[in-house]
């Protein structure tokens, strides 16, 4: 079982376990997302991402989730008994991100730039919202992220 984001291979992650961890946390912790008209991971961010581009984009998105979303969500988790599931999700994101080594070759600049523009669409949408609202929405959209990542999962 492995992810293949273009030439970037990731082993040691069982995708259904990520879904299970996400559902456990979301069903226990997730507060109401009242702004349903806005999506952070909008279709333009994830639509028709090439294999080569996927390595850059996955790296950027997972890094953001770890450093911004999960880090700030941890305080919410403390009140509930789902730390194990939250840790499963976060630790697997770390495992994936640590194995993603996007090429720094100059020939890949157009591809990395395209991935960066996609990521910026997401980050801008996040920053336009109140911090608390943005965190709730971003965590709620982990399912959109996992759905996209699933396309690169091989058995």
């Amino acid at each position: 079982q492995e992810f293949r984001f273009g030439s970037c291979q990731v082993t040691g992650v069982v995708l259904p376990e990520l879904w299970e961890a996400f559902w456990t946390v979301k069903n226990t912790v997730q507060t109401q997302d009242d702004i349903t008209s806005i999506r952070l991971l909008k279709p333009q961010v994830l639509r028709n991402v090439s294999g080569a581009e996927s390595c850059y984009l996955a790296h950027s998105l997972l890094k953001f989730y770890l450093n911004t979303v999960f880090k700030n969500y941890h305080s919410k988790i403390a009140k509930f008994k789902v730390l194990r599931s939250f840790s499963t999700l976060a630790n697997n994101f770390i495992v994936i991100m640590s194995q993603l080594q996007p090429s720094k070759d100059n020939s890949m600049l157009p591809i990395s730039e395209s991935a960066h523009q996609r990521f910026l669409l997401f980050r801008r949408a996040f920053k336009q919202l109140d911090t608390e609202v943005a965190l709730v929405k971003a965590f709620g959209e982990v399912d959109i992220l996992l759905t996209w990542m699933q396309k690169f999962y091989h058995l």
């Epitope: 079982q1 995708l15 259904p16 879904w19 299970e20 559902w23 456990t24 069903n27 279709p43 994830l46 639509r47 028709n48 399912d143 959109i144 996992l146 759905t147 996209w148 699933q150 396309k151 999962y153 091989h154 058995l155």
Partner: antibody, heavy 119, light 108 residues
Framework: ELQLVESGGGSVQPGGSLRLSCAAS????????MYWVRQAPGKGLEWLSL????????FYADSVKGRFTISRDNAKNTLYLQMNSLKSEDTAVYYC????????????WGQGTQVTVSA | SYELTQSPSVSVAQRQTAKITCGGD??????AQWYQQKPGQAPVMVIY???RRPSGIPERFSGSNSGNTATLTISGAQAEDEADYYC???????????FGGGTHLTVL
């Protein structure tokens, strides 16, 4: 050899109940999500329910929510579907299925059990 | 709720290429699966995650998924490929597995 064998089907009157079982063998049952899917006579496939490895999360189609309950006994390698308040439109062949391992991919299916709801 | 749309029937001459499509809003961002079902039998998965073949499925079966359409291609269709084919995806917003209505493939 991987096998999924459904049982518990039969005829029942509207408003009645049935409990379907699916006996699994040939794989590590506790490692896989399981599903129930049905097919009414001459119709297409309709997903009913999904249960995760430890039963911690369950999901249902709107058509059966509140009436059907999915469960599993990992010690017995068995999947269940408790069906209450049955209606004539629940008449169908009921299949259990095993996830391929990637999630949301019904990699192996049983042969199905017939459920008929009729007065 | 999320819907997947398939044309009810497709015909193909033996040894020719058959294409069966599955339409859904931005289905390209989801993983699409395909199942084959012959009369009186349980369905069999022929494609998962858009384009991957489970072991035991002939190479003539392939899949693609982009934009609003997922496609199952059977290159060099055989008489034994005559069956109903269903596409399927996961709708994360409704937490539901969704099947298309099915396409009956006739091999002439």
């Amino acid at each position: 050899e991987l096998q999924l064998v459904e049982s518990g089907g039969g005829s029942v009157q509207p408003g009645g109940s049935l409990r379907l079982s699916c006996a699994a063998s040939g794989f590590t049952f506790s490692n896989y999500w399981m599903y129930w899917v049905r097919q009414a006579p001459g119709k297409g496939l309709e997903w009913l329910s999904l249960i995760t490895t430890d039963g911690g999360s369950t999901f249902y189609a709107d058509s059966v929510k509140g009436r059907f309950t999915i469960s599993r006994d990992n010690a017995k390698n068995t999947l269940y579907l408790q069906m209450n308040s049955l209606k004539s439109e629940d008449t169908a062949v009921y299949y259990c299925a095993k996830d391929l391992g990637s999630g949301f991919s019904l990699g192996s299916w049983g042969q199905g059990t017939q459920v008929t709801v009729s007065a | 709720s999320y819907e997947l749309t398939q044309s009810p029937s497709v015909s193909v001459a033996q040894r020719q290429t058959a294409k069966i499509t599955c339409g859904g809003d931005n289905i390209g961002s989801k993983s699409a699966q395909w199942y084959q079902q012959k009369p009186g039998q349980a369905p069999v998965m022929v494609i998962y995650s858009d384009s991957r073949r489970p072991s035991g499925i002939p190479e003539r079966f392939s899949g693609s998924n982009s934009g609003n359409t997922a496609t199952l291609t059977i290159s060099g269709a055989q008489a034994e490929d005559e069956a109903d084919y269903y596409c399927q995806a996961w709708d994360s917003s409704a937490n539901a597995v969704v099947f298309g209505g099915g396409t009956h493939l006739t091999v002439l």
